[in-house]
């Protein structure tokens, strides 16, 4: 019963992580313009994402522009896009694997096969979490490096956007949820050996010994 609870908690966390990851990838708030030095009332703030950039005027009006050419984009941005999409697809695959092996489904009957599928889904979610973490950390590193680089002009300096924090949250939830699903498996998998023992005992010779004849030291 406890393992079922952990499984549910694990899958809820991974679902939250997936939604966070989707929002993080979609929002154009990976990089935010940083105005430093002389205190200035800035007329506009620029947000940059993986798919578009937006200019927010002091009036609150926002204009967004989708990036035109894929090939003209910087390689790190292309890589971040790819990893984001792959991470989301991997997490979806993990969810399908989990559903196939969940305690409440009948896709797979055998308990050990179910446990193996849940373990696999957990590993897949962990992989998805790592894949989410890579572009987020890479982008954050680039922003921080440029911020403190004296050669970079102030107009080119950026700050960490909300999407990066969402990305970290998404990654954490996917890793935690995936980890929980991996942890539920020993209890699910322990059904396996006793199941095989039962099968084995049916094919054992009819002559059986009394309980006292088994060496007790073999029992834990």
């Amino acid at each position: 019963m406890a393992s079922a609870g952990m499984q549910i908690l694990g899958v809820v966390l991974t679902l939250l992580g997936w939604v966070n990851g989707l929002v993080s990838c979609a929002l154009p708030m990976w990089k935010v313009t940083a105005f430093i030095g002389n205190s200035i009332v800035v007329a506009q703030v620029v947000w940059e994402g993986l798919w578009m950039s937006c200019v927010v005027q002091s009036t609150g009006q926002m204009q967004c522009k989708v990036y035109d050419s894929l090939l003209a984009l910087p390689q790190d941005l292309q890589a971040a896009r790819a990893l984001c999409v792959i991470a989301l697809l991997v997490a979806l695959f993990g969810l399908l694997v989990y559903l196939a092996g969940a305690k409440c489904t009948t896709c797979v009957e055998e308990k050990d096969s179910k446990a193996r599928l849940v373990l696999t889904s957990g590993i897949v979610f962990v992989i998805s979490g790592v894949l989410t973490l890579i572009p987020v950390c890479w982008t954050a590193h680039a922003i921080i490096r440029d911020f403190y680089n004296p050669l970079v002009a102030e107009a080119q300096k950026r700050e960490l956007g909300a999407s990066l924090y969402l990305g970290w949250a998404a990654s954490g939830l996917l890793l935690l949820g995936g980890g929980l699903l991996c942890c539920t498996c020993p209890s699910g998998g322990s059904q396996g050996p006793s199941h095989y023992m039962a099968r084995y005992s049916t094919s054992a010779p009819a002559i059986s010994r009394g309980p006292s004849e088994y060496p007790t030291k073999n029992y834990v």
Epitope: F35, I36, G37, N38, I40, V42, A43, N149, P150, L151, V152, A153, E154, A155, Q156
Partner: antibody, heavy 120, light 107 residues
Framework: EVQLQQSGPELVKPGASVKISCKTS????????MHWVKQSHGRSLEWIGG????????IYNQKFKGKATLTVDKSSSTAYMELRSLTSEDSAVYYC?????????????WGQGTTLTVSS | DIQMTQSSSSFSVSLRDRVTITCKAS??????LAWYQQKPGNAPRLLIS???SLETGVPSRFSGSGSGKDYTLSITSLQTEDVATYYC?????????FGGGTKVEIK
């Protein structure tokens, strides 16, 4: 007193390369970025690029990429600019200039200039 | 690239007159503007940074003003030693760009 001492005038043939130096004194060389500026005869100033003496990182004006290469020698607190494949268009006065500290990124100290003449 | 435009290429002014040199950026440069003075045969000398801050050792007759795209260098009472070419430069965005220069001469 902050001083930037540049190498003397150069007369070179088209197609050749030249390396101009800028020896600094009076401040900690690695704490400020060093930039180079071109001034063609009777014309305005053009920023070529800059280098961070601390780690050798460089930034270039797109116009001068492939033309100029910036380097430093920390041991002698000297900045260098190499110009390659020279043409008459490269004939100008070249200045090294120190860029100010945090929040004041203008060019606060300049070298006296190096006159480059490209002629056959 | 940000274009810096100095509308007048030269001024001929009487001694002790007020001189006003204008500089216009093609986009907002958020006060990241410097003014330089260059005398013939010499390297440029920084006069004003941050659009308004006078550098140490620069006479108080020099002053800078402006914001956004439009900036001004003023010399309240022109002296003979002020005969030079004045350049504005934006250091907001790379590549850093200079104005075409304004030559100040005495009538």
């Amino acid at each position: 007193e902050v001083q930037l001492q540049q190498s003397g005038p150069e007369l070179v043939k088209p197609g050749a390369s030249v390396k101009i130096s800028c020896k600094t004194s009076g401040y900690t060389f690695t704490e400020y970025t060093m930039h180079w500026v071109k001034q063609s005869h009777g014309r305005s100033l053009e920023w070529i690029g800059g280098i961070n003496p601390n780690n050798g990182d460089t930034i270039y004006n797109q116009k001068f990429k492939g033309k100029a290469t910036l380097t430093v020698d920390k041991s002698s607190s000297t900045a260098y600019m190499e110009l390659r494949s020279l043409t008459s268009e490269d004939s100008a006065v070249y200045y090294c200039a120190r860029r100010g500290g945090y929040g004041n990124f203008n060019f606060d100290y300049w070298g006296q200039g190096t006159t480059l003449t490209v002629s056959s | 690239d940000i274009q810096m435009t100095q509308s007048s290429s030269s001024f001929s002014v009487s001694l002790r007159d007020r001189v006003t040199i204008t500089c216009k950026a093609s986009e907002d440069i958020y006060n990241r503007l410097a003014w330089y003075q260059q005398k013939p045969g010499n390297a440029p000398r920084l006069l004003i940074s941050g659009a308004t801050s006078l550098e140490t050792g620069v006479p108080s007759r020099f002053s800078g003003s402006g914001s956004g795209k439009d900036y001004t260098l003023s010399i309240t009472s022109l002296q003979t030693e002020d005969v030079a070419t004045y350049y504005c430069q934006q250091y907001w965005s790379s590549p850093y760009t200079f104005g075409g220069g304004t030559k100040v001469e005495i009538k």
